[in-house]
């Protein structure tokens, strides 16, 4: 009989937690140093040896007395039924074709876990099993009592299973869902007796592959690889996850310490191409992602350093910096951004090897700026470095604009009192901190006579007492560097307050729209003047300079309030810089109803009439232009007298109303009355918006027609 190479010393052990049978065996009859390919046929039966549930051919290379191993994972927990294993072998090697036949079967090796379960009346398996959602799971109960009827529940819902034998029932769960972080509850209970037995099926969410796998280098020495791990298992006790990086060109492998990044030392042998496999693994499965790249194409430079802003003048500055080298021949592209008032105002790209330099021009004097620089690989752009930022302030320059100057001229005891006003220069015009204002008085009647007044900032005006001569006044603003151009205004011996007819203007939401006639002679411009707080001693004088070709403007201000009368004066500026009054305008941004009523006197009382008169009262203080008056007359008469009409008052009483539509009229005769009759009257002004407040009526009784006899 030919030499039989049979499997011998077969041992079967179990791993309940993993539901695995582990087989160990060897082949004794091999010659020393002989190595043959063999195939082993393995049969597994359940409950009875005749019930074979698994057959598998396992091929491997065998040496004499080598311990061979094979494992099988059971869908059914091993505690649910007795399992038996046997095997046979055959040579499957071209060296010895004559040995290609099966050996005899080994005897059946029996695995019966039930015998070691203990004496409880009921068991449920598997215990604390961990599966992924969507898996199929088989569970069973083992009962020690034949009499008891046993019911099993999945999350409180009764399950229906198949009886394997009188003591064992199996349940097949399909596509198990994730329910909660503490697992899915399954329990069985006996109809009689004190028995509930439960297990927890720990269902984890599907282990996802890492996302956004990417590698880059900052110095060509170390690669930093990052990824986003998939969502967690959803269980309170987290499954341990491991991450491994494998690089196929070098054949090197590293176990990553962290769950979302890993460092890799770049080979000193100038390896350029890298082919990485990132493998994520947990108890249940492995996931792999791949990345192939050229090292020089994945350079993320470090931020520029030694960054300085030098040679800062009023309008220029130079930025210098150094870059970290990324190889002998590489060029970096650097981007410079200049910020003013939080906005990018200049952007420039510069190529750099080691040292970078950039001149920033057209800057504003005495202004705060921020300049920042970042760099990237110029040949193979991957990522910009972080920004390095420096703040600087440009130097001051002389103010660029003349101050905007105006004046108010009053005649006091034969002198001219001139109040000068000027507006502070804007930041852009001042070019630095204004320290003082110079006011130069030039007497035009004695041109050689100059007087200098220096007024410290932040003053915005001064008062001058001048004789009746003509003066030219020069005002300049000064900072640490120099002087602004001069603003010139002239004052003549004649105050020039000629009488001009005042014209009414109507304000709108946008302000007051003012217009004037163009002047026939030479004018260098116009000035519109007004008070923002009329009636206030301080007045808050405002003015607006306009060009010589302008004949209208809109004056708007947040200070304009409803019911306040604003007076505007329009001046022409002669070629000698002397202002002269052209027009006066007056109006309300919004008219209101009158705030009070005039005091009314009654006279000339007769049996048939009486006369009313009232004083003119300050129009300036009225919250609107008075357009006329309403006179209300109450009497017992059923009909209103001629010239009046019926009116209903706010208290619903009825009376007669006379409309006086001439605002200048200050007397009114009430006629056609009845002798010995009782009357009441009340007078109120009205504006375009409405009448004044309703006040008390004055009582009057006409005498009878014979009372004078």
């Amino acid at each position: 009989e030919p030499l039989s190479l049979a499997p011998e010393s077969l041992e079967v052990s179990i791993d309940s937690a993993r539901q695995c049978l582990h087989l160990k065996w060897s082949v004794h009859n091999l010659a020393y140093h002989q190595e043959l390919k063999m195939v082993f046929q393995i049969e597994i039966s359940r409950i009875k040896t005749s019930n074979v549930i698994w057959v598998e051919n396992y091929s491997t290379t065998v040496k004499r007395n080598q311990v061979l191993r094979w494992s099988w994972e059971s869908k059914l927990p091993l505690e649910c039924a007795k399992h038996s294993v046997r095997m046979r072998g055959a040579v499957d090697d071209a060296q010895v074709p004559e040995l290609r036949f099966w050996s005899n079967w080994t005897s059946w090796e029996e695995v019966d876990v039930q015998s070691s379960l203990g004496h409880d009346p009921l068991f449920v398996f598997p215990k604390d099993k961990l599966v992924e959602e969507g898996s199929n799971v088989t569970i069973c109960y083992v009962s020690r009592s034949h009499q008891n009827n046993i019911s099993c529940y999945l999350e409180g819902v009764r399950m229906h299973g198949e009886q394997l034998d009188p003591n064992v029932c199996v349940f097949h769960l399909k596509n198990v869902p994730f329910i909660r972080e503490t697992g899915t509850n399954i329990y069985c209970k006996a109809d009689q007796g004190d028995v509930i037995k439960g297990i927890v099926l720990f269902v984890s969410k599907v282990f996802e592959e890492p996302k956004d796998f990417s590698c880059e280098t900052r110095d060509l020495k170390t690669l930093n690889c990052t990824w986003a791990p998939g969502s967690d298992a959803g269980l309170l006790t987290q499954l341990s996850q491991s991450y491994t990086l494998f690089e196929s060109f070098s054949g090197k492998k590293t176990l990553c310490k962290y769950k979302s990044w890993c460092n890799w030392q770049v080979s000193p042998d100038s390896q350029e191409m890298y082919n990485f496999t990132l493998t994520a693994e947990n108890y249940l499965r492995k996931r792999s992602v791949h990345l192939l790249f050229n090292l020089t194409h994945r350079v993320h430079p470090m931020a520029p350093f030694n960054v300085f802003v030098k040679n800062v003048s009023a309008t220029n500055a130079t930025m210098t910096w150094k870059v970290h080298s990324i190889g002998n021949y590489s060029t970096l592209l650097c981007q410079i951004e200049l910020y003013g008032e939080g906005k990018v105002i200049q952007k420039q790209n510069v190529s750099v090897k080691v040292n970078g330099k950039h001149l920033m021009k057209k800057l504003e004097p005495s202004t705060e700026y921020a300049a920042q620089v970042r760099c990237a690989n110029a040949n193979h752009f991957w990522k910009w470095s972080e920004w390095t930022r420096r703040n600087f302030t440009t130097a001051e320059a002389a103010p660029s604009e003349a101050p905007d100057v105006w004046r108010n001229v009053k005649s006091v005891q034969g002198h001219c009192v001139v109040t000068l006003f000027w507006k502070p220069l804007s930041k852009l015009q001042a070019n630095g901190k204004i320290l003082f204002y110079n006011v130069v008085l030039e007497n035009l009647d004695r041109p050689s006579t100059l007087k200098l007044l220096s007024i410290p900032a932040p003053a915005n005006g001064t008062e001058l007492t001048l004789d009746r001569c003509s003066y030219q006044i020069h005002v300049t603003a000064n900072n640490s560097v120099g002087t602004s151009p001069a603003s010139v205004i002239a004052v003549s011996g004649d105050p020039g307050n000629k009488e001009v007819e005042e014209e009414r203007v109507k304000g709108t939401e946008d302000g007051f729209c003012l217009s004037w006639k163009p002047q026939p002679g030479d004018v260098t411009g116009y000035v519109v003047e007004w008070c923002e707080r009329p009636g206030d001693p301080l007045c808050d004088l405002q003015w607006k300079n306009l060009g010589p070709n302008t004949t209208s403007t809109v004056v708007s201000s947040d200070a304009f309030r409803p019911g306040v009368r604003y007076n505007f004066r329009i001046y022409g500026i002669s070629t000698e810089r002397i202002p002269y009054l052209l027009e006066k305008k007056t109006g309300y941004s919004q008219e209101l109803v009158p705030s009070d009523n005039p005091q009314v006197l009654m006279s000339n009382l007769t049996s048939y009439s009486f006369t009313l008169s009232w004083k003119d009262y300050a129009a300036e203080s009225q919250p609107g232009f008075v357009q006329g008056y309403s006179l209300y007359l109450k009497s017992k008469a059923a009909r209103c007298l001629p010239g009046s009409e019926k009116a209903v008052l706010s208290d619903d009483s009825i009376c007669c109303k006379y409309k006086i539509d001439n605002p200048k009229q200050k007397t009114f005769v009430v006629e056609n009355l009845q002798p010995a009759s009782f009357y009441e009257f009340f007078l109120t002004p009205y504006t375009s918006v409405g009448e004044g407040p309703q006040g008390a009526f004055t009582k009057v009784t006409t005498p009878d027609e014979y009372s004078h006899i």
Partner: antibody, heavy 118, light 107 residues
């Protein structure tokens, strides 16, 4: 018959430590998850900690997390609760409980009193 | 954490009365609602688990019902030995939490 016997309760100062022990008998201990539940004097019940049958899954109430450790020795049929950094509010009777269904406390020991006081 | 609110906090009833105790969870607990009985000086005992399943050895006069967040323990005919404090408890979401208890006295 199912029996759970706790021991180890004592008077201890705040900041001190204690180890409670629960010995199980009358059933296959390794098949069951176990919990500790406590009851302060004159107060209601509060779950403290849970351990699965194989000891792989452990949960704690937030009030004891980081201070208490639950463990089991299936060979000795014993459940433990190591209590460190004890506070006065940990004063209670501690019950060892068998969980046939997770979060369901079917069988209770007679309890052991822990008093934390200075 | 899920709050369990029992009402009433105490009640007094005569033997033979029908007694109802309610328990409300602050969120859905998937019917993982258990009821326990604790007599003075004694250890708590499981009466009902999974909302309505009677634990072995518990008299049939005890019953449980409800779903979602509202649950009820009913004693159909009160016996003198039912004097005790009754606790509801949810086992769905960690931390597992108990109601504050309902004390039942016999008149």
């Amino acid at each position: 018959d199912v029996q759970l016997v706790e021991s180890g309760g004592d008077l201890v100062k705040p900041g001190g430590s204690l180890r409670l022990t629960c010995v199980a008998s009358g059933f296959t201990y390794s098949s069951y998850a176990m919990s500790w539940v406590r009851q302060a004097p004159g107060k209601g019940l509060q779950w403290v900690a849970y351990i699965s049958s194989g000891g792989d899954y452990i949960y704690y109430a937030d009030t004891v997390k980081g201070r208490f450790t639950i463990s089991r020795d299936n060979a000795k049929n014993t459940l433990y609760l190591q209590m460190n950094s004890l506070k006065t509010e940990d004063t209670a009777t501690y019950y060892c409980v068998r969980d046939p269904i997770t979060g369901t406390f079917a069988y209770w020991g007679q309890g052991t009193l822990v008093t934390v006081s200075s | 954490e899920i709050q369990m609110t029992q009402s009433p906090s105490s009640l007094s009833a005569s033997p033979g009365d029908r007694v109802t105790i309610t328990c409300r969870a602050s969120q859905d607990i998937n019917n993982y609602l258990n009821w326990y009985q604790q007599k003075p000086g004694k250890v708590p005992k499981l009466l009902i688990y999974y909302t309505s399943t009677l634990h072995s050895g518990v008299p049939s006069r005890f019953s449980g019902s409800g779903s979602g967040t509202d649950f009820t323990l009913t004693i159909s005919s009160l016996e003198p030995e039912d004097a005790a404090t009754y606790y509801c408890q949810q086992g769905n979401t960690l931390p597992w939490t108990f109601g504050q208890g309902t004390k039942v006295e016999i008149k």
